[in-house]
Interface confidence: low
Amino acid sequence: SAPGEDEECGRVRDFVAKLANNTHQHVFDDLRGSVSLSWVGDSTGVILVLTTFHVPLVIMTFGQSKLYRSEDYGKNFKDITDLINNTFIRTEFGMAIGPENSGKVVLTAEVSGGSRGGRIFRSSDFAKNFVQTDLPFHPLTQMMYSPQNSDYLLALSTENGLWVSKNFGGKWEEIHKAVCLAKWGSDNTIFFTTYANGSCKADLGALELWRTSDLGKSFKTIGVKIYSFGLGGRFLFASVMADKDTTRRIHVSTDQGDTWSMAQLPSVGQEQFYSILAANDDMVFMHVDEPGDTGFGTIFTSDDRGIVYSKSLDRHLYTTTGGETDFTNVTSLRGVYITSVLSEDNSIQTMITFDQGGRWTHLRKPENSECDATAKNKNECSLHIHASYSISQKLNVPMAPLSEPNAVGIVIAHGSVGDAISVMVPDVYISDDGGYSWTKMLEGPHYYTILDSGGIIVAIEHSSRPINVIKFSTDEGQCWQTYTFTRDPIYFTGLASEPGARSMNISIWGFTESALTSQWVSYTIDFKDILERNCEEKDYTIWLAHSTDPEDYEDGCILGYKEQFLRLRKSSVCQNGRDYVVTKQPSICLCSLEDFLCDFGYYRPENDSKCVEQPELKGHDLEFCLYGREEHLTTNGYRKIPGDKCQGGVNPVREVKDLKKKCTSNFLSPEKQNSKSN
């Protein structure tokens, strides 16, 4: 049984009747096949469900799909397949839902082989109505919405053409041929790579990076000898082939590719890769793969320009390009990230950082857990978290770690307690302080989700047998109650709640199987009557984030400031509500050396907060390439950590002088960059 299932638990009274009145079953008139579900808009209650069923015939595959719509968070569904003329929808493209609350939806249809182009169904009223549009091309990718204007769409065709629509898919124009990869930037800018000779694969490392800021009227070549590119926060990254050999280096731009600087990162060879693990407007986490097929690399964290990098974590587990990494941003607490390292003995261990990659440490052993067989010392061990890598290895882990920005401090994850990740059946652990301390929450693997900004946690046991029981907790996972939502158990396939964790509805998806047929079924449970009243001021308590030593004036200082949050008391059973906004009071901290990273030409010796000059650069003029010019740096070795808000205290001096020398590093310098018009 789950920890806390004892008499001391604050029970929610009469919950069975309250939940029974708010449990809604919908049986889909459908053969099983596959199902995909999308939420349309925020707080609209609109859900689209697409069921597809393939009938393999001798010569071809005959497909059938059905489209259902709910506008009450999944309590009731209406079959709207006729709105898309009973057309078979291609599930590999999914349902392309527009940004924000645009209410836009694009479905890509399956068409017969000989047709001139593809077909889409478009809705701009939250899927109440659809318009059929025949395309002048066959799409290779899902339609991509401009983040700034949901009327602007781009898509790649099967013939590598870049197509753009300015009227939400009504009319399409091919703006460029021979395109490998295209992405929306900010301000409706499109970045894309093109090949000149054979193909995307053949020209890898010889691609050109182009930009259009006017949807294809004019173009600018912003890079050559490109291997690939990526966008992260306000940074544009490109990996560029070196002149002399097959290595490549990362270049970075913060002005949409007008000027470039070489990132102070190791170059990589043909078999290696770079990966942007996380990026925001302040900084970036970059993974650089080790040479050879090691399965690991090094995490570097950038300065505010994305140019100077500090080594953050060695032996970071990342299997292959596009492979698996456990790197997870804990969104419920600023500065916290969790990932896995491959230790010397090839075991996998979890590491956590609370200061945006400054320092990494093992996760503290949960109070209520014993060390498992992987532990050499039965009294000293750590918690190790199962994430993407474990899931890819088909371990009994149904879900990755979960955190939500509006459920402050809460992190839920599968894990094991020992010296390394164990292949044994994991349990579910919870942290209520952003990863500093952990408690075993549920025995064995579960699906879990957060409702009402953390006011309710819902879980379902991961089992191969049919299930009919759901567990819920109103005190951040300390105590659990079980509710039987149906007499007839179902084969469970998924738990769905509205993104953002503000909803009080949960949908349990599964199928029923009888001798003759199997059908999709959903149960939607509304917890509003469990949380009978709205939360008041007395239901919240002050919590200082990142607090480790209440006697220290610096307690809670991370990246130069501390934050006090108003958090729901565990004992309060009430509704945060859909409009709940996290209340936080920041206060600035004094600067110490911890608030600075080591500047170019400097490094931090192990367990020291001072930056010292790199021996090989001692006595040399510090010159480096910035915005395509040689710069001279006068520094005492420190640069403020991106996003750090400290004031006063230690204030190291830093000055950069322009040496007026060019250093384009085989990248086009601004003077050479040519503009082209259509």
């Epitope: 610096e554 920041p586 004031q647």
Partner: antibody, heavy 129, light 107 residues
Framework: QVQLVQSGAEVKKPGASVKVSCKAS????????MSWVRQAPGQGLEWMGI????????SYAQKFQGRVTMTRDTSTSTVYMELSSLRSEDTAVYYC??????????????????????WGQGTTVTVSS | EIVMTQSPATLSVSPGERATLSCRAS??????LAWYQQKPGQAPRLLIY???TRATGIPARFSGSGSGTEFTLTISSLQSEDFAVYYC?????????FGGGTKVEIK
Amino acid sequence: QVQLVQSGAEVKKPGASVKVSCKASGYTFTSRYMSWVRQAPGQGLEWMGIINPVGGSTSYAQKFQGRVTMTRDTSTSTVYMELSSLRSEDTAVYYCARDPSGIAAAGPASRYYYGMDVWGQGTTVTVSS
Amino acid sequence: EIVMTQSPATLSVSPGERATLSCRASQSVSSNLAWYQQKPGQAPRLLIYGASTRATGIPARFSGSGSGTEFTLTISSLQSEDFAVYYCQQARLGPWTFGGGTKVEIK
């Protein structure tokens, strides 16, 4: 010697704004924060906010958020406090005070508060229709 | 925010006697506390910082003690110039907050 000299008394109508200045001398202006504290007639002291003269960054008490703006001019070693949308309850003496929050003791983990050690003479602001 | 509560509101003491003023914080402020003296028509003056360290030029008869949530300012032998209002102030967590003050008057 170290001193803070504030601008003279002001009489303002409700809804107006007031800008009080505080000129520092006798020490390195950028080496210390500056706090602003007010005192209504017959009442206690109320902290309004703090400014770091180095970069001009500020931290305001919630009560004054949106109404108060603290700025500094390093060329004249002067800090300013502007309060807008004045109401009668803003009638008070406004003090600037040197706040050595900007001193870090040795080592990153040690924080030590030295108190507001130098105060201006105060500026009386009267809000009346 | 951290609430600072001073007691008593008024303390009547004869010159030469000992005065003990109390200050309580709603949560721990460690030793990040200062005491100020204010006389009518004047700006406050720093007496004690770091809960127990006398500021420059402050006579030895003033002493501070305490840490966490309970603090005390002691004036061992009151002089005529010591009759004033005394405030405590925390600087552990923003916003800085003051106590309501204790008025020390002649008995």
